[in-house]
């Protein structure tokens, strides 16, 4: 035999008190399959979660953040405070990142700057608190009698073209 | 790739102004980053002053602080380094220099380095 139930379509939810009958979701709830037995409670966004999409009868409500914090976990289950680039989130707030790493995002936290010398290369830009160092040609490029010889044109990966 | 053409060079008195050009064709997209780099005779290549071709952020060489200034026009694909109260010491072949690979996605996790062909400064009286 058939579930009854099994007819019940999303946004309804088959109940027990009325023989079974397929009945909608009563407000601020959902269903987003069909044959539920209840529905479930709407999310609500309070607070620094502010609402993305409204709660329907078929899915739930969704969250993102208030502007100055950014959503954390899966389905935004949290709030975490923003810093500015060149700053890390810690216990006591936003600090500004040490001499020698850098952020450059609002959130996440403080990188060491790349060491050119590490990969045989020589530093052409500095870092900065919100930028990596950019590092510039070998120190053998630089050296008398290097030739100033420019690098054969690097292979296109397929489905790339230049601009 | 990248094609970088030197321009602007010379003879110059001590105190004297010079404004060298760049200008970048090709893949110029990939740049990330620029660079004036200098080499007396017999000496190594140094770098003068670079620059970041997104923000516009600049480095100089204690050297010439305070006398030099590196601009770019992305509009127009070409990096300058204009050269105020020059000396003899900064006397040299100017190389343009070009730094490709982060942040372009068909290059994505390649660099490559791009030197012009040099232009020469004199600085004498």
């Known amino acids: 035999l058939q579930d009854p139930c099994s007819n019940c379509p999303a946004g309804t939810f088959c109940d027990n008190n009325r023989n079974q009958i397929c009945s909608p979701c009563p407000p601020n709830s959902f269903s987003s399959a069909g044959g539920q037995r209840t529905c479930d409670i709407c999310r609500q966004c309070k607070g620094v979660f502010r609402t993305r999409k409204e709660c329907s009868s078929t899915s739930n409500a969704e969250c993102d953040c208030t502007p100055g914090f950014h959503c954390l976990g899966a389905g935004c289950s949290m709030c975490e405070q923003d810093c500015k680039q060149g700053q890390e989130l810690t216990k006591k707030g936003c600090k500004d990142c040490c001499f020698g790493t850098f952020n450059d995002q609002k959130r996440g936290i403080c990188r060491p700057w790349t060491n050119c010398s590490l990969d045989g290369k020589s530093v052409l830009v500095n870092g900065t608190k919100e930028r990596d160092v950019v590092c510039g040609p070998s120190p053998a490029d630089l050296s008398p009698g290097a030739s100033s010889v420019t690098p054969p044109a690097p292979a296109r990966e397929p489905g790339h073209s230049p601009q | 790739q990248v094609q970088l053409v030197e321009s602007g060079g010379g003879v110059v008195q001590p105190g004297r102004s010079l404004r060298l050009s760049c200008a970048a064709s090709?893949?110029?997209?990939?740049?990330?980053?620029m660079g004036w780099y200098r080499q007396a005779p017999g000496k190594q290549r140094e770098l003068v002053a670079s620059i970041i071709t997104g923000d516009g952020d600049t480095n100089y060489a204690d050297s010439v602080k305070g006398r030099f200034t590196i601009s770019r026009d992305n509009s127009k694909n070409t990096m300058y380094l204009q050269m105020n109260s020059l000396k003899p010491e900064d006397t040299a072949v100017y190389y343009c220099?070009?730094?490709?690979?982060?942040?372009?996605?068909?290059?994505?996790?390649?660099?490559?380095?791009?030197w012009g062909q040099g232009t020469q400064v004199t600085v004498s009286s």
């Open positions: 220099y070009a730094r490709t690979g982060e942040g372009s996605s068909w290059l994505e996790g390649h660099e490559y380095d791009y």
């Open positions: 090709g893949s110029t997209f990939s740049i990330v980053a």
